[in-house]
């Protein structure tokens, strides 16, 4: 028998990656950094 | 609120051609998931699933009947119309239509059914 | 197609006893997306069948919560912890994962 029509059984939760990089003063060179949903991770 | 009614013939003669009619309100077959479906039960006996329709214009029938089924809709008069040819008087029954939304937040279910109609095939 | 057993198909009941029908199907009706979309109906005398309960277990908006079920697999069973009067009716569990969907033969809840 065929399967009826059915949404997948899992949401898909769509958030913002960010990358930045920030300037720490000239002999400190830059952080890059990923921000995922409001966090750094990297 | 959500309510579907079904209208069509009280009585058809054999081998005619039965077309059904669900005029719904409280929601649109344009949003997305939304479906409409049919079902029928004889006098006495159990309930028994026909067609369904979506709010893409895909249709799901059941194989024993598909060939005297087609399902259609009016997103624009809130209707889904049902047509059954060749009818049989064991075709006699009440016809129903409901109410079944896809989604994650949906309930997914046959949530709400019209009052039905009774069909007597006889000639 | 899934063939849907209900038993028993008469249950006389005394108000206030607690109720219980067992659904079978004749294969399993896990849907690939990882739902079973089992579902109760009640048809009341006169009525349109009303939703009761959806996804084996999920209660209907309003429906009172001595009504529960359970189940996996091809085995499932709607309770009523305690019968009243206007729980009368035929109770039909229906499968929606697969094409035709198909329903119980019912079962005749009476109070005694």
């Known amino acids: 028998d065929a399967e009826f029509r059915h949404d997948s059984g899992y949401e898909v939760h769509h958030q913002k990656l960010v990358f930045f990089a920030e300037d720490v003063g000239s002999n400190k060179g830059a952080i890059i950094g990923l921000m995922v949903g409001g966090v750094v991770i990297a | 609120q959500v309510t579907l009614k079904e209208s069509g013939p009280a009585l058809v003669k054999p081998t005619q051609t039965l077309t059904l009619t669900c005029t719904f309100s409280?929601?649109?077959?344009?949003?997305?998931?939304?479906?409409v479906g049919w079902i029928r039960q004889p006098p006495g006996k159990a309930l028994e699933w026909l067609a369904h329709?979506?709010?893409?214009?895909?249709?799901s029938y059941n194989p024993s009947l598909k060939s005297r089924l087609t399902i259609s809709k009016d997103t624009s008069k809130n209707q889904v119309v049902l047509t059954m040819t060749n009818m049989d008087p064991v075709d006699t029954a009440t016809y129903y239509c409901?109410?079944?939304?896809?989604?994650?937040?949906?309930?997914?279910?046959?949530?709400?059914w019209g009052q039905g109609t009774t069909v007597t095939v006889s000639s | 197609d899934v063939v849907m057993t209900q038993s028993p198909l008469s249950l006389p009941v005394t108000p206030g006893e607690p109720a219980s029908i067992s659904c079978r199907s004749s294969q399993s009706i896990l849907h690939s997306n990882g739902n079973t979309y089992l579902e109760w109906y009640l048809q009341k005398p006169g009525q349109s069948p009303q939703l009761l309960i959806y996804?084996?277990?999920n209660r209907f908006s309003g429906v009172p919560d001595r009504f529960s079920g359970s189940g996996s697999g091809t085995d499932f069973t709607l309770k009523i912890s305690r019968v009243e009067a206007e729980d009368v009716g035929v109770y039909y569990c229906f499968q929606a994962s697969r094409v035709p969907l198909t329903f119980g033969q019912g079962t005749k809840l009476e109070i005694k």
């Open positions: 996804k084996v277990s």
């Open positions: 409280g929601f649109s077959l344009s949003t997305s998931g939304m479906g």
């Open positions: 329709i979506w709010w893409d214009d895909d249709k």
């Open positions: 409901a109410r079944r939304q896809l989604g994650l937040r949906s309930i997914d279910a046959m949530d709400y």
